[in-house]
């Protein structure tokens, strides 16, 4: 019950706490459990203590065994004891399992990655973030005291995130990494069959001839992560690359949206140099997801050019 | 109404591969959608995947990397590319085509009688 694991990698710091907790005044005794050895405090020693805390300052493999603890009051002694397992740093980027710190699950609402064991250190911000071994980069992630917060969270955010961080002890600095799982979970998340919210079905749009016109074609397919959401242009019931109107092009990408936690996706049609032969066209909107297909029809009308006789 | 016939289920080794097909026919006029879900014995429905009209494919979770969807738009085909199979894929697997004509407003998945895949040493 008052052991306590814990792992850090060669040429890093590693800190470890007694397990056995007592107030501030308490003094505290460590030892190498295996010769029974005191743990001096003096901090010019690679390994030293320094009350509650076994510093390894920077750890070494052979640093790895059981380590004892003592605390003792006026009135009694509490041991606990700490097994310290120090490894070579990997070559490759994978983590082995027992590196790894407990798993922490994310969603929409909530996306918080705590850097593990980072209270024991010293340190100061910012800390470093990787995910996979990749530097996280752009504006959905964000760096903020002990934990990172990653913004609109994806089922492709789960993964192994890293954090690196300089402890600082006496001016001099040592660099340490934690490593743990994030995964995503839907938070109520639920689908339903596709709402089309623009354009109105059987919609009539006025254009004018000669000009540039678009077509957003909008709809919502449920709440959280959807397995499968689309929406599409079909002109004359077929796909726009068939149809061979270069004038005509569906916007490259959808474009996703999460209005009162909906998730909405939007597809714009752009209509270039709008010819008579436009007005003759059915222009299908589509909204595509497990439940089925819904589709609205809009035709295009001609627009009057505003009189300015007088 | 499109009808669908699906073919390639049979029994491999975990490890191993098998292409399953799915041909439609019936009103197969403005097809917007097909794909494939499956069904192990006293287990839920399990969509695998949907390819668009467009081209544009959507995967579960769980097959991502060892399942791919193509289709033949020219003969109407879909198809499911199962690569390094384990014996938790064993089910029937459905093929499902979503579209019909453009008069219709709201259409839903209709699917095929389905192909046994067992996987098994």
């Known amino acids: 019950k008052f052991s306590k694991q814990s792992w850090g990698l060669e040429n890093e710091a590693l800190i470890v706490r007694c397990p056995r907790q007592g107030k501030p005044s308490y003094t505290v005794d460590w030892y190498y459990s295996q010769t029974n050895k005191s743990i001096p405090t003096q901090e010019r020693n690679r390994v030293f203590a320094s009350g509650q805390l076994l510093k390894f300052l920077p750890a070494a493999v052979a640093d790895s065994g059981i380590y004892t603890c003592i605390v003792r009051s006026p009135t009694f002694n509490r041991t606990g004891y700490a097994n310290v397992t120090i490894y070579k740093k990997q070559s490759d980027c994978n983590v082995p399992d027992y590196l790894m710190y407990s798993t922490v699950s994310g969603s929409e609402k909530n996306s918080k990655i705590y850097c593990p064991t980072i209270d024991l250190y010293n340190w100061t911000a910012p800390l470093e973030w990787f995910k996979n071994c990749q530097a996280l980069q752009g504006s959905r992630y964000r760096a903020h005291k002990s934990f990172l917060v990653i913004d609109n969270v994806m089922t492709e955010d789960a993964g192994d995130y890293t954090c690196k961080f300089i402890h600082n002890e006496n001016g001099a600095n040592y660099s340490v990494t934690a490593t743990r799982s994030f995964t995503v979970k839907d938070e109520q998340g639920f689908s339903l069959f596709p709402v089309i919210g623009a354009p109105a079905q059987n919609e009539i749009k006025e254009v004018e001839i000669g000009k540039n016109a678009n077509l957003t074609c909008s709809a919502c397919f449920g709440k959280g992560t959807q397995f499968l959401a689309a929406v599409l242009w079909q002109l004359n019931g077929t796909k726009i690359t068939d149809f061979g109107e270069p004038r005509i092009q569906q916007e490259e990408g959808q474009n996703q949206s999460f209005s009162n936690g909906l998730a909405c996706l939007d597809m714009v049609l752009r209509i270039a140099d709008v010819k008579e032969e436009d007005l003759l066209l059915q222009y299908d909107c589509l909204a595509l997801n497990l439940h089925g297909l819904r589709r609205h029809t809009v035709r295009l009308s001609r627009k009057n050019p505003i009189d300015h006789h007088s | 109404e499109v009808q669908l016939v699906e073919s390639g289920g049979g029994l491999v080794q975990p490890g191993g591969s098998l292409r399953l097909s799915c041909a439609a026919s019936?009103?197969?006029?403005?097809?917007?959608?097909m794909g494939w879900f499956r069904q192990a014995p006293g287990k839920e429905r399990e969509w695998m995947g949907v390819?668009?009209?467009?081209?544009?494919?959507y995967y579960a979770d769980s097959v991502k990397g060892r399942f791919t969807i193509s289709a033949d738009n020219s003969k109407n085909t879909a198809y499911l590319q199962m690569n390094s199979l384990k014996p938790e894929d064993t089910a029937v697997y459905y093929c499902a085509a979503v579209g019909g004509a453009t008069t219709v407003t709201a259409s839903e998945w209709d699917w095929g009688q389905g192909t046994l895949v067992t996987v098994s040493s």
């Open positions: 390819i668009a009209y467009d081209g544009s494919t």
């Open positions: 019936g009103s197969i006029y403005s097809l917007v959608a």
